[in-house]
Amino acid sequence: QDKPFLSAWPGTVVSEGQHVTLQCRSRLGFNEFSLSKEDGMPVPELYNRIFRNSFLMGPVTPAHAGTYRCCSSHPHSPTGWSAPSNPVVIMVTGVHRKPSLLAHPGPLVKSGETVILQCWSDVRFERFLLHREGITEDPLRLVGQLHDAGSQVNYSMGPMTPALAGTYRCFGSVTHLPYELSAPSDPLDIVVVGLYGKPSLSAQPGPTVQAGENVTLSCSSRSLFDIYHLSREAEAGELRLTAVLRVNGTFQANFPLGPVTHGGNYRCFGSFRALPHAWSDPSDPLPVSVTGNSRHL
């Protein structure tokens, strides 16, 4: 109860040039505190200073990366200060160029199955960090495999549940500067599929169209889905539309594909706004073929 609690807002992973608030909370309401940094480069603005409630630190540089603790003022202690708080590790990103993040076999993962997240770079990173958006806990630390072309790490994640789904990024770092991180990889949305019954997918005017003709794919279900997602086989990404309640009691979204030049196998999924990374089973595949064009798939 006498030891304060240190936290970082909005989080412990901070982009170079941004600000971070270090908040030291005392259960007993001792509002004044001191901050110390245990490792890495010294941060002069912390020394011989007393802060009240919180400290806005920044613009952050690589020198700010490291482990922080706070002590709250404590009138009954011989030193006038409490015992040190929990450690908070501040990691500064943007120091090295970004790695790439991929999912194998793909970012749509069946409920209960496993996905491999692969983070790789042409920089020789000894460490990688995997971070899920919206999570305040420290990112997952992974040991990189070094090779001539750079470095990589494979992280096996599963069995897949809605709790594991989300937007992931990875960072790279080198051993002698563990809290100075690369820029984040591009975000990767990991989606758990198969949580709800499959919707139906149909094409208007039909699944076989002339090259250049307009086609609309309709995804519908009696489930109260908020959003439908349309994906094309062998293509990354998806189209997303809000579901609309139809007179016949189904929830439907119409995807206008415009003038089509080549076909392919399409599937759609339903999801709810509250759980954007948790989708239904896929609809049965709908092959759209284009006539008067050499490429059918």
């Epitope: 109860q1 006498d2 304060p4 609690f5 909370r25 005392s26 259960r27 007993l28 309401g29 001792f30 509002n31 009240r52 409630n53 919180s54 404590h74 009954h76």
Partner: antibody, heavy 119, light 107 residues
Amino acid sequence: QVQLQQSGPDLVRPGVSVKISCKGSGYTFTDYAMHWVKQSHAKSLEWIGVISTDSGTTNYNQKFKGKATMTVDKSSSTAYMDLARLTSEDSAIYYCARDSSYYVRFSYWGQGTLVTVSA
Amino acid sequence: SIVMTQTPKFLLVSVGDRVTITCKASQSVSNDVAWYQQKPGQSPKLLIYYASNRYTGVPDRFTGSGYGTDFTFTISTVQAEDLAVYFCQQDYSSPWTFGGGTKLEIK
């Protein structure tokens, strides 16, 4: 379940002292700090102070320094508050309240002890 | 110490009404504000902490919002059992201070 059981009402003469007790049960007493709060018609709710049930460290609202003294007896899981040199201004309901974390200050409250100061 | 000014002091409402109570802090308190309900003859009960987080077991008709100096507490659909006095409290800096209270009465 968590319970904070306070001592009964007190009718006291001006100038004397009173000791209110608050017994915690249904949880580990020394894991949570204990607060005292005054409720009077004139001033709504006022925080008096907090005591660490583990170390006995106290932090008082400046306004109540010299008026209130908080103590704990770990062996009986009881927190106490002494109110000294009572005047009619001290007539109020006094609550003990337990915290839950660094972010939840007054999560469980005792039933309150009515102190009436009257000649 | 930080002064919490709560308005209105009294509210006369019907069952089913939407009710909003505001609290203004004399200086910024970040999002360190809690809201309490005190029914007649009872102790205060925590409803909202950290400005917008509902405490365990609190019905979702009670919501809180705000940051800095201006905070709002809302009951989306008043029920007969919501007859009580509601208090805001800043949790930012000791001495922790309370608003003057809002007495909710049902028509």
